[in-house]
Interface confidence: medium
């Protein structure tokens, strides 16, 4: 999906209202310096691409993020503020429903959510000239 035409400011507002707090809740008890941020993004569409990938694509050691509250709210925000996003996600959603529900907070998941926080931070505050 090409995130170029999303309403970035509306997504930012959704993040500030709820998603950010859910990420903090998920990471509670973890030190802010515990993980090195290795994932980066250069502009807002790129940040959303990386955010979508880390949030919804299962990775080795962390297969359960898509069911978390912050992930569901992220999905809702993208569906509302990115034209045509919902349509591209139907197949992905059906595939997700077939997987067993597994709510395990692994260290790998914590590391992944730490990466997500950095990506969201970058998305929300690109340097002023990029706005």
């Amino acid at each position: 999906y090409d995130f170029t035409n999303c309403d970035f400011e509306k997504i930012k507002a959704a993040y500030l209202s709820t998603i950010s707090k859910d990420l903090i809740t998920y990471m509670s008890g973890t030190k802010s310096t515990e993980f090195n941020n290795t994932v980066s993004c250069s502009n807002r569409p790129h940040c959303l691409t990386e955010i979508q990938s880390l949030t919804f694509n299962p990775t080795a050691g962390c297969a359960s993020l898509a069911k978390e509250m912050f992930a569901m709210k992220t999905k809702a925000a993208l569906a509302i503020w990115c034209p045509g996003y919902s349509e591209t996600q139907i197949n992905a959603t059906q595939a997700m429903k077939k997987r067993r529900k597994r709510k395990v907070t692994t260290n790998k998941c914590l590391e992944q959510v730490s990466q997500l926080q950095g990506l969201w931070r970058r998305f929300n505050r690109p340097l002023l000239k990029q706005q």
């Epitope: 970058r122 505050r125 706005q131």
Partner: antibody, heavy 120, light 111 residues
Framework: EVQLVQSGAEVKKPGSSVKVSCKAS????????MHWVKHAPGQGLEWIGA????????SYNQKFKDRATLTVDKSTSTAYMELSSLRSEDTAVYYC?????????????WGQGTTVTVSS | EIVLTQSPATLSLSPGERATLSCRAS??????????MHWYQQKPGQAPRLLIY???NLGSGIPARFSGSGSGTDFTLTISSLEPEDFAVYYC?????????FGQGTKLEIK
């Protein structure tokens, strides 16, 4: 503990340059925008510019664009602000500041300030 | 650039009194229903300290006697009952539009 520690006071001649450092600790330096703010005697606060350590991208207040250079050294989690062609009106306290965690656009952590005096 | 005008320039009050500081922007600092206006306190020889973010949210560790309100172009910082340590300079700041700007400050002094 999250903190920013700046280099010591400087006394410079007009026309010379000064480079102020700001060492970060207690947070993931590469994912926060780092800003520099000027506070001249008897004046208000003035934004100089910002840098994103993740890729070195910068944004400047047009007023300082020609004379200020912002850089970072990710290996030491240090931000730098170099000001060239110094003049008397550059006499001020210079602060580095971290932009907030969420992206609200406020400064939640500040350095202690570096006094730069420009005098012949 | 957005110009922030703070008033009054100096406010003389006594401990226990209520302080009302104003910040007016030359154009709206709102975006998608959020007001990107922040307030700082600065004491002599110290770095500024965040008081209020996004118009009305209390910064970490800031006493409840501080509050912020407003949207669009008009914003207010209120200190409900002044403590001796509240006498300082207060700045508003916007980051909605390039370049980021601060107000010129309001000095709150003991009467």
């Amino acid at each position: 503990e999250v903190q920013l520690v700046q280099s010591g006071a400087e006394v410079k001649k007009p026309g010379s340059s000064v480079k102020v450092s700001c060492k970060a600790s207690g947070f993931t330096f590469s994912t926060y925008n780092m800003h520099w703010v000027k506070h001249a005697p008897g004046q208000g606060l003035e934004w100089i510019g910002a840098i994103y350590p993740g890729n070195g991208e910068t944004s400047y207040n047009q007023k300082f664009k020609d004379r200020a250079t912002l850089t970072v050294d990710k290996s030491t989690s240090t931000a730098y602000m170099e000001l060239s062609s110094l003049r008397s009106e550059d006499t001020a306290v210079y602060y580095c500041a971290r932009e907030d965690d969420y992206g609200e656009g406020y400064f939640d952590v500040w350095g202690q300030g570096t006094t730069v005096t420009v005098s012949s | 650039e957005i110009v922030l005008t703070q008033s009054p320039a100096t406010l003389s009050l006594s401990p226990g009194e209520r302080a009302t500081l104003s910040c007016r922007a030359s154009e709206s600092v709102d975006n998608s229903g959020l007001s990107f206006m922040h307030w700082y306190q600065q004491k002599p020889g110290q770095a500024p300290r965040l008081l209020i973010y996004r118009a009305s949210n209390l910064g970490s560790g800031i006493p409840a006697r501080f509050s912020g309100s407003g949207s669009g172009t008009d914003f207010t910082l209120t200190i409900s009952s002044l403590e001796p340590e509240d006498f300082a300079v207060y700045y508003c700041q916007q980051i909605n539009t390039d370049p980021l700007t601060f107000g010129q400050g309001t000095k709150l002094e003991i009467k």
